[in-house]
Every structure is written in structure tokens, then in C-alpha cells.
């Protein structure tokens, strides 16, 4: 098991729009139709003002109007919920579809896409119903923008909630070589298909993807627990033939100085098809992007039952070393290295300030907001501090899969 690793199934807590944990000052918009439809009126289930945020401009055809929520700290956002305008039950404005953009630093914005590259999310069919959208893959974000859409000139209004949990790993980005394709009886695509950073010259940098999405792969890397996805989907993999150095090098950037106890790497070991655990791992540490690597690298040779073909989490001790950047080399012990998840066990160094602009107020690991309770068809789960359930039969959730 990935000790200390977050469980995406439990990361579904209301982040504070409905219960006002998110203050008005952290909700903004590109424009508002009037003060009574300002951004602060965009809270799910709220009837404040004229009952929603409504942009001043048309969202057709440009789709440039947005509602922005600042979560103040990095969160894993697993679901979003939307509603139209309340207006004492007389509101007629809602958004049939929308896009999401998100940012971890307030500078670089990424468009959310589902596992098949679709950006447009099905929204509401009426002004009052709440429609929840499972975000597969989830997004690691501090700021989230909702861009309502329309297929003609019309008024749209929006109330929203976000659901997820605090991103306590603190990982801002990882840099890695682009994953490769293995050819068996069918092509096995071992690329990082949800990576949200840049790709240049065979290197991915500045983003997060499948190695940080909480989903660990199966023993047989050709199979996935996700439906309707290609062979190899859960894993990112590299062939020994492509690396004359004999290792794959990755770099990890964190939000602030941390003391690192361990790195956990979920690896495939289906050696009959060429996948092997790394023979060893070597990590270097530094406190800033332009600083020198400090001290001796931490080296860890992997023992254990290498003949056991089951996938497993390998724990690499990091000795409490303090850093904001890690560079790790994973040594080939066979034809292929296949990873499905990498996580870190670390503690924030108390006197360190965050790498992102501004100082963040403390936030609980589980935000206190309960899930919405006005559905008759929620899953049968206790209320209060429980992950939010999907509104059964909601038209939003369109997974292209089996």
C-alpha cells in the first residue's frame, strides 16, 4: 500500500462556497451584470442578491466570462457542482455547459480536460437543480475558474461549489522524460496522459499528471481499473534502450521547504513482459531552483522479492533531508521501468514561507463543509464530515468508457 498517500475516493469534501468558509473576498469574476448578481452571490444553494453570479457580457460566441474561486492553498479538486439563478424560484438563467480553468500559482492557467481530451462539461438543465461533475482526472489547484458556455446569445447565471481536499503532499510539479510505447500483441501506451505541464524535446516539465493522481496500477499493466481506456493507461513507462545512462531522472518541486522522510513509488514488476522494479534510487536535494545540490545524494538499493510479479509500492528512505527540490534517478534493473504513482512523506519546515505568492492562512486537511443535502437520491452515506455523493442520474457525468 502507498502509506500516507491520499485516497481519491475520500477526497470529496465541500470546500466552502455553500457554507461560506470561502470568504466573499476570494470569489471574483471577469464581470457582473449588476451588483445584485456579483461574484459573491455565486454560492451553491444561496439565494443572496438576485440569486447567482451573472456576467455582464454575452458568453456566446467568445466564452471569455468567468467566475473565479481562490482556495488560498493547493487543493485536489475532485468534483464541482453547479446551479442556475434562484431569484425566489423565478430565475430562468442557467448554463447548459461550461469549461474549467485552474492555476496553482495565479500565473499559469491550465484548461481541465477529461481522460479523453474533452474540455466541455455538461451543466444544468434548469435553474434550481444541482448537477455534480466528477472530475476524472481531478485537478490540483489553488484557483479555479468557471467559464459558462452557450450556443446562442442568451443570459447565463451560475452558482457553484467545489469538492475535494487539501493537497498535503505539497508537490507543485514533476519533471520527467515523456513516457513511451511498448509493443506487445497490441500497443501499450505508457505516456502520462493527464500531465498538465509543458512538453519539449521529449521532456515534460512544470506540471502534474498520472504519477500524482492517487490511482495505483494493477499487477498487469495492460489492464486498468478505469473503463474504456487504452492498454497501459495507469502507468508511465520508459525503455532501458532509450537511456544510455542506465537510469530515468526525475525532478520534483514542492510548495515550500520540507523535511523528507520517504518517497513512495508504486512500480510494476511484471517481469515476464519486461517490467522490473528499479534496481536502486538515488536522490539529491536543494532548497531553491538556482541553488547547488546539497550534500551527498541519498542512495537506496532495492532488495525484496524481485521475482514476485505483483505491482507494489517501493519505499525510498530520504533521511529527513530538507529541500524544496528533489532530483531522483531510478536505475533500470530490466528492460522497462513502469510507475503508476509517486508520493512523498514529509513535514513542512516551520519557518519556511510558501513558494507561491502571498502567505496562506492555515487550512484544515479536511475542510469542514458538508456535502449538499437537498437531494433525494444521494448515496446512502452518513452526512456531515463525509465525502460528497453524486446526485444519482445526473446528466453531467459522461465517461467515454465501459
Amino acid at each position: 500500500d502507498m502509506k500516507g498517500h491520499f485516497d481519491p475516493a475520500k477526497c470529496r469534501y465541500a470546500l466552502g462556497m455553500q457554507d461560506r468558509t470561502i470568504p466573499d473576498s476570494d470569489i471574483s469574476a471577469s464581470s457582473s451584470w449588476s451588483d445584485s448578481t456579483a461574484a459573491r452571490h455565486s454560492r451553491l444553494e444561496s439565494s443572496d442578491g438576485d440569486g447567482a453570479w451573472c456576467p455582464a457580457g454575452s458568453v456566446f460566441p467568445k466564452e471569455e466570462e468567468y467566475l473565479q474561486v481562490d482556495l488560498q492553498r493547493l487543493h485536489l479538486v475532485a468534483l464541482v457542482g453547479t446551479q442556475g439563478r434562484h431569484a425566489g424560484g423565478l430565475g430562468k438563467e442557467f448554463s447548459r455547459s461550461y469549461r474549467l480553468r485552474y492555476s496553482r500559482d495565479g500565473r499559469r492557467w491550465m484548461g481541465w480536460k477529461d481522460r479523453w481530451g474533452q474540455e466541455v462539461i455538461s451543466g444544468n438543465e434548469d435553474p434550481e437543480g444541482v448537477v455534480l461533475k466528477d472530475l476524472g482526472p481531478p485537478m490540483v489547484a489553488r484557483l479555479v475558474r468557471f467559464y459558462p458556455r452557450a450556443d446562442r446569445v442568451m443570459s447565463v447565471c451560475l452558482r457553484v461549489e467545489l469538492y475535494g481536499c487539501l493537497w498535503r503532499d505539497g508537490l507543485l510539479s514533476y519533471t520527467a522524460p515523456v513516457g513511451q510505447t511498448m509493443y506487445l500483441s497490441e500497443a501499450v501506451y505508457l505516456n502520462d496522459s493527464t500531465y498538465d505541464g509543458h512538453t519539449v524535446g521529449g521532456l515534460q516539465y512544470g506540471g502534474l499528471g498520472q504519477l500524482a493522481d492517487g490511482v495505483v496500477g494493477l499487477d498487469d499493466f495492460r489492464k486498468s481499473q478505469e473503463l474504456r481506456v487504452w492498454p497501459g493507461y495507469d502507468y508511465v513507462g520508459w525503455s532501458n534502450h532509450s537511456f544510455s545512462s542506465g537510469y530515468v531522472e526525475m525532478e520534483f518541486e514542492f510548495d515550500r521547504l520540507r523535511a523528507f522522510q520517504a518517497m513512495q513509488v508504486h512500480c510494476n514488476n511484471m517481469h515476464t513482459l519486461g517490467a522490473r522494479l528499479p534496481g536502486g534510487v538515488e536522490c539529491r536535494f536543494r532548497r531553491g531552483p538556482a541553488m547547488a545540490w546539497e550534500g551527498e545524494p541519498m542512495r537506496h538499493n532495492l532488495g525484496g522479492n524481485l521475482g514476485d510479479p505483483r505491482a507494489r509500492a517501493v519505499s525510498v528512505p530520504l533521511g529527513g533531508r530538507v529541500a524544496r527540490f528533489l532530483q531522483c534517478r531510478f536505475l533500470f534493473a530490466g528492460p522497462w521501468l513502469l510507475f503508476s504513482e509517486i508520493s512523498f512523506i514529509s513535514d513542512v519546515v516551520n519557518n519556511s514561507s510558501p513558494a507561491l505568492g502571498g502567505t496562506f492562512p492555515p487550512a484544515p486537511w479536511w475542510p469542514p463543509g458538508p456535502p449538499p443535502t437537498n437531494f433525494s437520491s444521494l448515496e446512502l452515506e452518513p452526512r456531515g464530515q463525509q465525502p460528497v455523493a453524486k446526485a444519482e442520474g445526473s446528466p453531467t457525468i459522461e465517461f467515454r468508457m465501459d
Epitope: R228, P231, K390
Partner: antibody, heavy 117, light 111 residues
Framework: DVHLQESGPDLVKPSQSLSLTCTVT?????????WHWIRQFPGNKLEWMGY???????KYNSSLKSRISITRDTSKNQFFLQLKSVTTDDTGTYYC??????????WGQGTLVTVSA | DIVLTQSPTSLAVSLGQRATMSCRAS??????????MHWYQQKPGQPPKLLIY???NLESGIPARFSGSGSRADFTLSINPVEPDDVATYYC?????????FGSGTKLEIK
């Protein structure tokens, strides 16, 4: 391995609702996979009815959409089938099963449901 | 909906010989360079059992006597050599498009 077991009444009257439970052991239904209901008619024809995804979303066979509902209770690791307004044509063996991107790898043993007055 | 047509409806093969059965889809079930077609074996009183996934991959624990081939809309399941335990009905199933559909089955008997 994942183990699934169907349970529910074996006789339902026409126009009533059919309700079945699938209890899953050795695996959490919120951790992965899609959790499906499939039925087999007396002539052995197999029909996929719908699923609930591990993330909570549902998808139904359009031929049943107005009558079917699949829900779950994650605390009990169970998922449920409700089929409304049944007729004698709904008689058959009902299976719960799970799938990833490689077909229905795990099946329950099935439960025979007869719709009869 | 994608219709899967299996042929023959029934098949009698001598022990030790090869059995071959076909599944034809009304449209392609390929995507991402792979075929979302799977094969199952069902014996009386039992649920279907996954044999082959994504056209040609042998499910773990299934003997190598079973093999699958094909792409797009034409697929074949072969059993070589046939053994007494193989007497069953064999179904193909596609998961490329909702709703997922099954073929009507091929019943294998021993001559």
C-alpha cells in the same frame, strides 16, 4: 480477487419494482472499476443494464433508462439495482459484475428473478 | 447499438482438434489502436467467465489453448486442442460503445 454476491427476492409481481443488492468483498467499490448489472433471459440472451462508476457516476442502457436506477452504499460496500414497472419480459437471471478496460472480469453467481402474478 | 453476430450457432468438434468461432460487429469496435472486444465461456448454472480481453489478450489463469484474433469488426476465438472441459457456450462482447452488447453465443459440443 474481487467477490460479488447478488441478493433479493426471487419472485416479483408485474407492475412492481424489482430491487437487488450486490455485496462486494475483498475490494472497495470506491477504489476502482465500474460496477455493473447484467441480465440473462431464459433463452440465454445477455443484456447489459447499466453501471455505477467507482467515482459515483451512472450509465444506463437506453432501452431501460426510464425504469432503471443503480445506487450504492459505500459504507456497506454494496450497490443496488432498482427496475420499476416490471413485466414478465423482465424474468431472467440477474448478475452483478465488475469491469475495467478489459471486459467483465468478475461476476456474481447470479440470482433468478421471476416476474409473475 | 452495436449488434454482434456470432457464427456458427453451434459447433461440434472432435477432441484434440481445433474449434474456431466468429463474431462480427455491425460497426468497428476499435479505438486507441486496440479492439474493445472480449470473449467469455459460460457453462450451465454458472456466470460467464472472461477468457480473452481486447481481442487477443489471454486472461490470467486461462489455458493457452484459447486464443483470440481480429480487429475492427471481425473477430475469431480459437480453441486448440479442444478438451472435454471446453463444452460450453461462448459469447463475444464489445465495450467500445455504450450500450455494451453481447453476441448471441456459439455452443461448442464434442463430436
Amino acid at each position: 480477487d474481487v467477490h460479488l454476491q447478488e441478493s433479493g427476492p426471487d419472485l416479483v409481481k408485474p407492475s412492481q419494482s424489482l430491487s437487488l443488492t450486490c455485496t462486494v468483498t475483498d475490494y472497495s467499490i470506491t477504489s476502482g472499476y465500474g460496477w455493473h448489472w447484467i441480465r440473462q433471459f431464459p433463452g440465454n440472451k445477455l443484456e447489459w443494464m447499466g453501471y455505477i462508476h467507482y467515482g459515483g457516476s451512472t450509465k444506463y442502457n437506453s432501452s431501460l433508462k426510464s425504469r432503471i436506477s443503480i445506487t450504492r452504499d459505500t459504507s456497506k460496500n454494496q450497490f443496488f439495482l432498482q427496475l420499476k414497472s416490471v413485466t414478465t419480459d423482465d424474468t431472467g437471471t440477474y448478475y452483478c459484475a465488475t469491469s475495467g478496460n478489459y471486459g467483465f472480469a468478475y461476476w456474481g453467481q447470479g440470482t433468478l428473478v421471476t416476474v409473475s402474478a | 447499438d452495436i449488434v454482434l453476430t456470432q457464427s456458427p450457432t453451434s459447433l461440434a468438434v472432435s477432441l484434440g482438434q481445433r474449434a474456431t468461432m466468429s463474431c462480427r460487429a455491425s460497426e468497428s469496435v476499435d479505438d486507441y489502436g486496440t479492439s474493445f472486444m472480449h470473449w467469455y465461456q459460460q457453462k450451465p448454472g454458472q456466470p460467464p467467465k472472461l477468457l480473452i480481453y481486447r481481442a487477443s489478450n489471454l486472461e490470467s489463469g486461462i489455458p493457452a489453448r484459447f486464443s483470440g484474433s481480429g480487429s475492427r469488426a471481425d473477430f475469431t476465438l480459437s480453441i486448440n486442442p479442444v478438451e472435454p472441459d471446453d463444452v460450453a457456450t461462448y459469447y463475444c462482447q464489445q465495450s467500445n460503445e455504450d450500450p455494451f452488447t453481447f453476441g448471441s453465443g456459439t455452443k461448442l459440443e464434442i463430436k
